[in-house]
């Protein structure tokens, strides 16, 4: 006997069409585009039934349900809206996705999703990953007239990717996105083998204040150049923090140099170095500290430090040098690690030019200068670093 | 983002039911997405689903266990819960509930021992 | 009743592809899902419907499911990798687990 005539479920079709269908005959199901075979609950690849001797089919009719994107995953220092309707999250329903205004900015794409048939949210490039709300870098409450200035104070929010790492010393660093550290290869080398030793404090101006930001080392990664105890070329260091930090006006990560940022960078050019490290009073300071400095003429740096007590080729074209001819303006131990940072006035936004490594037994000391690991010589090995891990 | 928490007697005697909740936070249980399910993982075992239930109360369950098997749901406390009656010590196992949407399992709870003996 | 096997175990060096199989009948007419525990951690989705990824599963594991094996494969397999695989399945809207595959990752 023949089995009843099937009927399409809503928003599909039945193939093949016969007059009758009889013993062993089968069809199957097929959906139109952004509906998906549903037994139930449960996604079926294919549908497919065949007319029993007594006159059944051997399955019952699955439906064609709309593809559901479900809800969009969160956004990380983001936020997403419902375009279509509140809570749709059907096939072409359409979600916007934003970032937390001033401190983040989206990356990827434009932030606008579509459900589409394959149910994934994708954006209009095709991706079905998020999109990335990265922290925007350089921002600081401070503007630099250019003058040169020694040992001020800082206010809130004027070095807010200033980094206080306790370990075996006290030392600096500077904070790069929202969970790396850029810091001195030296001031971490100790804790290379154990990163969860590092004590790192950021968002506050006072060394010894219980209020700040904690963040721990999962990992700290030293320049394979570098060599303890044998000079200060490859003097850099890149801690991955376990967590991201929230970024806002007293924690936000530095930028690292363009291309371009030479041209910020040339002798005479004014930078900044932040720090706890000693002060004139030869004791660390309580408040966090910083003081405009000249970059030097890298000859005259070199020749500065040809003399003993320094071997020749102290100086080497990884590093540049800053300070004045007359002394009195410095970093100083316990600064180690911290970054010298020029304003982009092109981009207006504050961008590591060199990080805190070195310099004359006596600080600020006349005719001597202080030395910095040249950043923008290492943007390779730090974009790699931070991309592999 | 959506969290599952399972609770219940950790400890349950042979011929008596074992009875566990699992509190859903961060999103609705009356999401139409969604089903609800129970696995269970026996010590040093694979994993055996158990059922699943949607917030209308409409239920799966796997055939081996059906006749001892209840899963209810309580939408207003965003709860969904697993009664097995007459448990032995095969039925000690690691008890896990999972977001069921359209037969994936993501997430799941962190799962909760269920030992059963005298 | 329907089953699904897997092997109980198999072992990959760092950076090499690991292939694990899940074998049933006519498994490739249906879906298959894979499961990633760790120990003493909750099962983790890695894919559902043959060969999608979930949203923070990194693209080195894929899967594809044809006649009667579905197979997970990570490319590139970091020592974080090192867990208990699981496949499944709905047979006749029944969820059915594979019984699992301990890759060990060596070195």
């Known amino acids: 006997q023949p089995c009843p005539y099937p009927m399409a479920p809503p928003n599909g079709h039945v193939s093949p069409v016969q007059a009758k269908y009889i013993l062993k005959d089968s069809f199957s199901i097929f959906c139109e585009t952004g509906y998906e075979l549903l037994q139930g609950h449960l996604p079926l690849k294919s549908f497919t039934a065949v007319c029993q001797k007594d006159g059944s089919w051997d399955r019952p009719m699955p439906a064609c349900s709309i593809v559901d994107c479900g809800p969009p995953d969160d956004l990380p220092s983001g936020r997403v809206e419902y375009i279509t309707g509140p809570g749709v999250t059907t096939y072409k329903a359409v979600i916007q996705y934003s970032c937390e205004e001033t401190f983040y900015t989206m990356k990827v794409n434009d932030g606008k999703y579509v459900c589409e048939a394959d149910g994934f949210w994708t954006s209009s490039k095709g991706e079905k990953s998020l999109p990335v709300c990265e922290p925007v870098c350089g921002l600081s409450a401070r503007t630099t007239g250019g003058q040169i200035y020694g040992g001020q104070k800082a206010k809130p929010g004027d070095f807010p990717w200033q980094v206080l790492i306790l370990g075996g010393t006290t030392a600096a660093g500077a904070l790069l996105y929202d969970n790396w550290v850029l810091t001195a290869a030296h001031a971490v080398y100790e804790q290379k083998h154990d990163a969860s030793a590092l004590d790192i404090r950021m968002g506050t101006l006072k060394r010894l204040s219980p209020h700040y930001t904690q963040a721990w080392s999962e990992a700290v990664f030293i320049h394979e150049g570098y060599t303890h105890d044998a000079g200060f070329d490859n003097d850099i260091a890149l801690i991955k923090l376990n967590n991201k930090v929230v970024i806002n006006s007293n924690i936000t990560p530095i930028c690292l140099p363009r291309k371009e940022a030479e041209s910020f960078m040339r002798t005479d050019d004014i930078g900044t170095a932040s720090g706890w490290g000693l002060t004139q009073r030869g004791f660390l300071a309580r408040n966090l500290m910083y003081v405009d400095i000249p970059i030097v003429d890298h000859q005259k740096c070199t020749a500065a430090y040809e003399k003993p007590p320094y071997p020749r080729g102290s100086v080497t074209a990884n590093m540049l040098c800053a300070g004045l001819e007359s002394g009195g303006k410095d970093s100083c131990r316990g600064d180690s690690g911290g970054a010298l940072v020029f304003l982009d006035s092109e981009t207006e936004r504050w961008f590591v030019g060199g990080i805190v490594s070195w310099g004359s037994m006596n600080c600020g000391e006349a005719g001597q200068y202080g030395v910095y690991t040249k950043v923008i010589n290492y943007i390779p090995w730090i974009e790699n670093i931070i991309s592999d891990f | 983002q959506v969290q599952l928490q399972e609770s219940g007697p950790g400890l349950v005697k042979p011929s008596e039911t074992l009875s566990l909740t699992c509190t859903v936070s961060?999103?609705?249980?009356?999401?139409?997405?969604?089903?609800w399910g129970w696995i269970r993982q026996p010590p040093g075992k694979g994993l055996e689903w158990i059922g699943s239930?949607?917030?209308?109360?409409?239920?799966y369950y796997n055939p081996s266990l059906k006749s001892r098997v209840t899963i209810s749901v309580d939408t207003s406390k965003n709860q969904f819960s697993l009664k097995l009656s007459s448990v032995t010590a095969a039925d000690t196992a690691v008890y896990y509930c999972?977001?069921?949407?359209?037969?994936?399992?993501?997430?799941w709870g962190q799962g909760t021992m269920v030992t059963v003996s005298s | 009743s329907y089953e699904l096997m897997q092997p109980p175990s198999m072992s990959v060096s760092p950076g090499q592809t690991a292939s694990i199989t899940c074998s049933g009948d006519?498994?490739?007419?249906?879906?298959a899902y894979w499961y990633q525990q760790k120990p003493g951690q909750s099962p983790v989705l890695v894919i559902y419907q043959d060969n999608k990824r979930p949203s923070g599963i990194p693209e080195r594991f894929s899967g594809s499911n044809s006649g009667n094996t579905a197979t997970l494969t990570i490319s590139g397999t970091q020592a974080m990798d090192e867990a208990d695989y699981y496949c499944q399945a709905w047979e006749s809207s029944t969820g059915v687990f594979g019984g699992g595959t301990k890759l060990t990752v060596l070195g």
């Open positions: 006519k498994l490739g007419d249906i879906y």
């Open positions: 961060g999103g609705s249980i009356s999401s139409s997405s969604y089903y």
């Open positions: 239930i949607y917030y209308s109360g409409s239920t």
């Open positions: 999972a977001r069921d949407r359209r037969g994936r399992f993501d997430p």
